[in-house]
Amino acid sequence: FVRTKIDTTENLLNTEVHSSPAQRWSMQVPPEVSAEAGDAAVLPCTFTHPHRHYDGPLTAIWRAGEPYAGPQVFRCAAARGSELCQTALSLHGRFRLLGNPRRNDLSLRVERLALADDRRYFCRVEFAGDVHDRYESRHGVRLHVTAAPRIVNISVLPSPAHAFRALCTAEGEPPPALAWSGPALGNSLAAVRSPREGHGHLVTAELPALTHDGRYTCTAANSLGRSEASVYLFRFHGASGAST
């Protein structure tokens, strides 16, 4: 089929349109979808194409991270004339096609959301057989996963000169604020480390020097809730060891 220079328009709905007088491919995806961890989310994606009444083999694909090269998280294939898109790949069994690709709908449902699912997703359709064509959303849809705080680690570690320090790591979205409380502390934010690269939802707070025995409590809070965990420090006085 004829290919001419493209005219690209994109609006706030992330409608990606590439048109020419003879044909029109377009994909409609929202910029962002938000959902809470543990819940399900729907990633909408619909498309139009220039191949009138196409009923040949097709493959629907969703990938994560980046267009064209990101890892596939879902793939299904429909045989010639079939309305059924048979799932060939569903990462961890959590991805399910809601739409009907034969009706230009690639919408995807993601079950049991986790913070690790917070990334950009790209829908793609491939026609095979007599018509040989393909199209992928270039901007994709951002899945924004929110979560109440959860303390993933709390520990007491030795420091130089027989001292001790406490570390508290929590995850959540928005990233939680951390506070320590304990003997002679009151409430302290105590050296909060910003989220680490590649671990965008993790926040760590350190108490650099534990001066008193007793119970130290870390509290993590964001707009969705709060969580706390405690660690106990008992030093054997006159010895260099400690019990936690």
Partner: antibody
């Protein structure tokens, strides 16, 4: 590290058959189309066949259609090329390659020589 | 099928000098998505081909940035900005827009 390794080719008489295999590693095999590309001695590259992710769709160049069959075993990360009714003009080094629509033939095997002669 | 025509057939380049190789397709390789489905490969003597450029102008992983690709819908150019001894070999353009997928006949690049 991505690797594609072809099985040994060999010497075969015209009209006979030969099956090539290609073991892939270092990437999610089922996420990609795969293809065979050949190169006759002192000649250029010639695409032979391609196969979709799940083996549902296959493509062939006209000169091998009906004689060659491309297939794959995703559980074993292996690509195959069954060559029947071989002709002298099929003599070439056969390369197994990962076919990425937007990324090209990004990874190639070392090639295996198939000689068709009486 | 789409015919890919390369020029010149061979070229000799002095080390440090630049070289350009041309490729023309019999049909536009610009897809309506905006992607141009042309690719460049290098086959060094006695070796398998390797991908240099994908989607007309994108440098493949591990390829030195002295290589660059450009072009329009049907006319494409591979440029090597500073020729090195390791760049000798046969350069092929290829298309993945339509079946059958085709390559150019190759351009042999030698050191002067």
């Amino acid at each position: 590290e991505v690797q594609v390794v072809e099985s040994d080719g060999g010497f075969v008489q015209p009209g006979r058959s030969l099956k090539l295999s290609c073991a892939a590693s270092g990437f999610t095999f089922s996420d990609y189309y795969m293809a065979w590309v050949r190169q006759a001695p002192t000649k250029g590259l010639e695409w032979v066949a391609a196969i979709s992710y799940d083996g549902i769709t296959t493509y062939y160049r006209d000169s091998v259609m009906g004689r060659f069959t491309i297939s794959r075993d995703n559980a074993q990360n292996t690509l195959y090329l069954q060559m029947d009714s071989l002709r002298s003009e099929d003599t070439a080094t056969y390369y197994c390659t990962r076919h990425d629509w937007e990324g090209g033939f990004a990874y190639w095997g070392q090639g295996t020589l198939v000689t068709v002669s009486s | 099928g789409i015919v890919m025509t390369q020029a010149p057939l061979s070229v000799s380049v002095t080390p440090g000098e630049s070289a350009s190789i041309s490729c023309r397709s019999s049909k536009s390789l610009l897809h309506s998505s905006g992607i141009t489905y042309v690719f460049w490969y290098l086959q060094k003597p006695g070796k398998s081909p390797q991908l240099l450029i994908y989607r007309m102008s994108n440098l493949a992983s591990g390829v030195p940035d002295r290589f660059s690709g450009s072009g329009s819908e049907t006319d494409f150019t591979l440029k090597i900005s500073r020729m090195e001894a390791e760049d000798v070999g046969i350069y092929y353009c290829g298309q993945l827009l339509e079946n059958p997928f085709t390559f150019g006949s190759g351009t042999k690049l030698e050191i002067k």
